[in-house]
């Protein structure tokens, strides 16, 4: 069979997990962003299903803070500043890759993890279910 | 500060650019889970500021396919079903972590980017500037 | 070495439901980054990628034929599977698995094909 | 989907000439990454593709260096210096740049 050409200045890989474990650069591109959705933004606050943004802390995962959005109301704030409950704010949920150190207090190693996060708010029709 | 103790089991990171270069097992936790927005919710149909999802498909990424939220309109969907133009939709902004093959043909070498992604939209009021 | 080996029925009338299987060897889908593509070409005409699976179980289809496409796999067999329903004539065709690998380039491994009529 | 076109439909050659067969795509095939992801394939009587080319210039492993792959945007084309009796089948371009990926409808490479 054909081999694909291996770029000579690959890491070895002739570890026993291969190719399950990887080496990943962490000199990030574009990481100088900010990552504090209350500074980037304030449409948590003039949405019209406003969002609290949380801090999620975990020292033992990278990033090891992420902002969770957790719905103010359950309905929706209307022309006249009031919840309107015949709408619904509800959460837009992402699923984002994360690196958790695995073992723990390894410096140097972590296992890719995917979780589900809060990343703000929409207004929607409540789907009505009718009882016959 | 407190040191966190180093675990005896940790690979080894003699490594001339460690921390930069870390050891990450791809063995992905929760990875079965739905990564087609369409399929997981019907809110970006339902919502006062409804958005298209379009799919963002790099070959030489992980995640290869990223659906990127557009929303529909500038103004938000009233009651009647129409668009509002004294209120907006806006899209909701969220920094996510990829990998990126890098140098390429390398089967076990990455870089971790940090890319911004549109995950919805929301309605928000306008900021009105009043000319002097 | 990579090999890849489709299977199917060759024979189907109209209506009725392809159910392909492409075997190999060489490399794994439990491994990061593998993904296997399923690709045909009706008799003296070009070819048509039809579907795609990612180790991670992210399936992609052509959208011109997704209501009709299921693509599975099981990993622990390293066998990929393709179903079609409701087969007309126009699915008359070699059908090919391929190879892919997250990287710079689509599918580096074919199988032989298998060839599949549609006749009532 | 991106139409590619391919001309032409056959190319008689000469063994140890030089053949060249055009791709054209719909619409521009450069991704967003900035990579183009075109590729070319060659598929023998009888045969499966064999991947040629990627990324519009690139020769894939045990490719020979006859063979040369050019072009940007919408317009490519694959070259094959001094032609060999092994390089006679149908040669279809592919692009993966845009989703749903598709194919050429291919170019015949025949003797003269």
């Known amino acids: 069979g054909i081999t694909i050409p291996r770029n000579p200045g690959c890491p070895n890989s002739e570890d026993k997990n291969f190719p399950r474990t990887v080496m990943v650069n962490l000199n990030i591109h574009n990481r100088n962003t900010n990552t504090n959705p209350k500074r980037s933004s304030d449409y948590y606050n003039r949405s019209t299903s406003p969002w609290n943004l949380h801090r999620n802390e975990d020292p033992e995962r990278y990033p090891s803070v992420i902002w969770e959005a957790k719905c103010r109301h359950l309905g929706c704030i209307n022309a006249d500043g009031n919840v309107d409950y015949h709408m619904n704010s509800v959460p837009i949920q992402q699923e984002i890759l994360v690196l958790r150190r695995e073992p723990p207090h390894c410096p140097n190693s972590f296992r890719l993890e995917k979780i589900l996060v809060s990343v703000g708010c929409t207004c929607v029709t409540p789907i009505v279910h009718h009882v016959a | 500060g407190i040191t966190i103790p180093r675990n005896p089991g940790c690979p080894n990171s003699e490594d001339k650019n460690f921390p930069r270069t870390v050891m990450v097992n791809l063995n992905i936790h929760n990875r079965n889970t739905n990564t087609n927005p369409k399929r997981s919710s019907d809110y970006y149909n339902r919502s006062t500021s409804p958005w298209n999802l379009h799919r963002n498909e790099d070959p030489e990424r992980y995640p290869s396919v990223i659906w990127e939220a557009k929303c529909r309109h500038l103004g938000c969907i009233n009651a009647d079903g129409n668009v509002d133009y004294h209120m907006n939709s806006v899209p909701i902004q969220q920094e996510i972590l990829v990998l990126r093959r890098e140098p390429p043909h390398c089967p076990n070498s990455f870089r971790l980017e940090k890319i911004l992604v549109s995950v919805g939209c929301t309605c928000v009021t306008p900021i009105v500037h009043h000319v002097a | 070495q990579v090999t890849l080996k489709e299977s199917g029925p060759g024979i189907l009338q109209p209506s009725q439901t392809l159910s392909l299987t492409c075997s190999f060897s060489g490399f794994s889908l439990n491994t990061f980054g593998m993904g296997v593509d399923w690709i045909r070409q009706p008799s003296g005409k070009g070819l048509e990628w039809l579907a795609h699976?990612?180790?991670?179980?992210?399936?992609y289809y052509n959208p011109a034929l997704e209501s009709r496409l299921t693509i599975s796999k099981d990993a622990s067999k390293n066998q990929v599977f393709l179903k079609i329903a409701n087969v007309d004539t126009a699915d008359t065709a070699t059908y090919y698995c391929s190879r892919r690998e997250l990287g710079p380039y689509f599918f580096d491994y074919w199988g032989q094909g298998t060839t599949l009529t549609v006749s009532s | 989907g991106v139409l590619m076109t391919q001309t032409p439909l056959s190319l008689p050659v000469s063994l140890g000439d030089q053949a060249s067969i055009s791709c054209r795509s719909s619409q521009s095939i450069v991704h967003s990454n900035g990579n183009t992801y075109l590729e070319w394939y060659l598929q023998k009587p009888g045969q499966s593709p064999k991947l040629l080319i990627y990324k519009v210039s690139n020769r894939f492993s045990g490719v020979p260096d006859r063979f040369s792959g050019s072009g940007s945007g919408t317009d490519f084309t694959l070259k094959i210096n001094r032609v060999e009796a092994e390089d006679l089948g149908v040669y279809y371009c592919?692009?993966?740049?845009?989703?749903?990926?598709?194919f050429g409808g291919g170019t015949k490479l025949e003797i003269d």
């Open positions: 699976i990612w180790w991670d179980d992210d399936k």
């Open positions: 592919f692009q993966g740049s845009h989703f749903p990926y598709t």
